[in-house]
């Protein structure tokens, strides 16, 4: 009869590499008498005999994982015990190897030029796959703008037109390679005018062609505006080639005008617009009807800083040697004159003077100042500053004040354009944009009632806080 023999593991467990969905087997050969009981653990947790994911054969000496999963990674141990001597154990690791798999592939992207684009490419695999990108037919090279992130995603800073194209990501490890589907990166470009229309000085009855060329992605549409309104007459020809639109407006000239080319394209729900303007003037047009010469620029003075619309362009009159300084000096002097007027009148008068002296400006080849709307001028004259206006008119006939060198006329309200005729042709005074009900007392004026309706606009303030603290020294 055989003598009892304690168990000995003759083939210790080794590390097993296995691919996902493949079979993995651990062999634990044991010599002993009587026959041992063999149990198996994974990460110190007992594998149950009836677990259908495993097959245990050869009296427990053979453990087979029937279809390896990612989560099967770990340390497997077999323990043999037959009651003779102590139990013996051997352990080995299962390393689940996995061909690259793209779990979050890139998708088609539309992006506006200059923004940041991120194309995702999240991968799985063991060993961890390296991710590279292909644009068109060739490998994409990283640079200061283009980087493959740790996650595998492709990040492009400050997207340029030339970044548009077809992309795919490639995940690679020692077991294989996975490719994503091709995706499209479309770069949308804000509408931009390449060639602005040129100004013309022509004789009455001439034909003139204004040309405007714009680029963008998608290709922009071009519309034409004449003195602030849609062009009423004239023929338009358009030609589109390689994202560039060329529009030509042919006009029969019977009056001078400011013609604006507006290029627009759409990016999702938003639109981008570019504008360029040209003037058509008529030779020998009477001098009195010509615009004064000047230029449009940002107001950077002090006196009217809180009164003028922030960051708007204002008109500087080049009949002064130094327009910016001369106009600032005029308003500085006028402001001092206003110290004596009533609290009701002062802010309204300040708004009127600042917007009259620094008129809002439409840039172009011939910059055009935009006068104050007649209704606002009358509101100041006949409502807010009725007494003061009469007194000042008596003193200086046409103007608020005279200084040694300059004469600053108060605008003649009746000669100003009405906002009811063309709201875009004149400037509103923000100080007066409030409901007329907010006035509780009516200035006494010579006529029985004022000849003006204050524009009934949304309430912005119920009182006139005196605008900027400005110490005159």
């Amino acid at each position: 009869e055989k003598l009892p023999k304690a168990p000995v593991i003759t083939t210790p467990l080794e590390t097993v590499d296995a691919l996902v969905e493949e079979v993995a087997t651990f062999m634990c050969a044991v010599e002993s008498y009587p026959q041992p009981e063999i149990s198996w653990t994974r990460n110190k947790i007992l594998i149950k005999l009836f677990d259908t994911r495993y097959s245990i054969r050869e009296n427990g000496q053979l453990l087979t994982i029937l279809s390896v999963e990612d989560s099967d990674d770990g340390i497997y141990c077999c323990t043999a015990n037959n009651g003779v001597g102590g139990a013996v154990e051997s352990c080995g690791a299962l390393q689940v190897k996995m061909k690259p798999k793209i779990t979050r592939p890139p998708i088609n992207v539309k992006i506006i030029e200059g923004l940041k684009a991120v194309l995702p490419c999240t991968t799985m695999g063991n060993p961890k796959p390296s991710v590279s990108w292909i644009k068109g037919d060739s490998a994409l090279r990283e640079n200061s703008r283009i980087a493959v992130l740790e996650s595998g995603s492709l990040r492009i800073h400050n997207v340029q037109k030339e970044d548009a194209g077809q992309y795919r990501c490639v995940a690679k490890n020692s077991l294989g390679t996975a490719y994503s589907k091709l995706v499209k990166l479309e770069v949308e470009v804000f509408a931009r005018i390449l060639r602005a229309p040129e100004s013309h000085n022509v004789t009455f009855g001439s034909f003139v062609t204004l040309r405007c060329t714009a680029i963008g992605m998608p290709v922009p549409t071009i519309s034409w505006i004449e003195n602030g309104n849609a062009v009423s007459s004239g023929s338009i020809q358009e030609n589109v080639k390689d994202r560039v639109i060329d529009s030509r407006l042919q006009l029969f000239i019977t009056k001078p005008g400011l013609y604006t080319c507006i290029a627009t394209n759409k990016h999702g729900e938003k639109f981008s617009t570019a504008k360029a303007a040209a003037t058509v003037s008529i030779a020998e047009w009477s001098k009195s009807q010509k615009e004064s010469k000047g230029y449009c620029a940002q107001y950077r003075g002090e006196v009217c800083d809180a009164v003028l619309v922030k960051d708007s362009l204002v008109f500087f009159n080049t009949s002064y040697p130094d327009p910016e300084e001369a106009q600032e000096l005029l308003i500085h002097t006028a402001w001092n004159e206003l110290k004596a007027v009533s609290p009701l009148c002062r802010p309204a008068a300040e708004a009127l003077l600042c917007n009259h002296l620094f008129q809002e400006c439409s840039p172009g080849v011939l910059p055009t100042p935009m006068p104050i709307c007649r209704e606002y001028c009358l509101a100041v004259k006949e409502l807010f500053c009725a007494k003061e206006w009469l007194a000042m008119e008596g003193k200086t006939h046409r103007g608020l004040y005279r200084s040694g060198m300059h004469f600053l006329p108060v605008p003649e309200c009746s000669k100003l354009p009405s906002m009811h005729q063309d709201p875009t042709a004149c400037t509103r005074l923000p100080y007066l944009d409030y409901k007329k009900e907010n006035i509780t007392t009516f200035p006494s004026i010579t006529s029985s009632k004022p000849s003006v309706d204050i524009p009934n606009l949304p309430a912005s303030t119920s009182s006139f806080a005196v605008s900027p603290a400005y110490s005159m020294t």
Epitope: Q298, R300, E302, S471
Partner: antibody, heavy 121, light 112 residues
Framework: EVQLLESGGGLVQPGGSLRLSCAAS????????MSWVRQAPGKGLEWVSA????????YYKESVKGRFTISRDNSKNTLYLQMNSLRAEDTAVYYC??????????????WGQGTLVTVSS | QTVVTQEPSFSVSPGGTVTLTCGLS?????????PDWYQQTPGQAPRTLIY???SRHSGVPDRFSGSILGNKAALTITGAQADDESDYYC????????????FGGGTKLTVL
Amino acid sequence: EVQLLESGGGLVQPGGSLRLSCAASGFTFSDYGMSWVRQAPGKGLEWVSAIPGSGGSTYYKESVKGRFTISRDNSKNTLYLQMNSLRAEDTAVYYCAKRSGRIAFGALDAWGQGTLVTVSS
Amino acid sequence: QTVVTQEPSFSVSPGGTVTLTCGLSSGSVTSSNYPDWYQQTPGQAPRTLIYSTDSRHSGVPDRFSGSILGNKAALTITGAQADDESDYYCGLYMYSGSKNYVFGGGTKLTVL
């Protein structure tokens, strides 16, 4: 002839204070905006602060806001820059400059010779 | 934060013409930035050449002219002379949010 003469520079420890002065002559001081401009050793020009002729407003570079104060005394034809909580990066030659007109941001059309401020422990 | 950009260095032959430019890291330079140009020789205070885009400061030779070219301000020196070798800075009025004035990094002009 327009003349601008800075003074008040010197060596100061980090966190310390200095007051620069600029004495102006040769023009009607109150009619012109003034500015301070600095230049760190071997570096370019950097606008620091501006004030209009009236002294009614003041403007500062973001990094000096709350630490520097520009002021002027039109009766003394003098421009000042009070510098508090000084840092090593404030080390520079500080120029006083006259603007071309009464506003704070006209062109800088006349410059002083500068005064050196060194912030070091 | 918007940065004012200039070419770090430029060279020109005596008698030649050179155009130095001044741009913005985002956006275009316009007349509303009132571009000014300054010249500085080592150890000296700066000297104003051009103000408000194209106005020449008194005493500045008409070899120096200012303009806006495309989306940048430009300083053109025609008939360059040896003593034009200097650092040139542009200054721009900036007005988004709060008013300030920003200099470019400067261009070192060498007259070879």
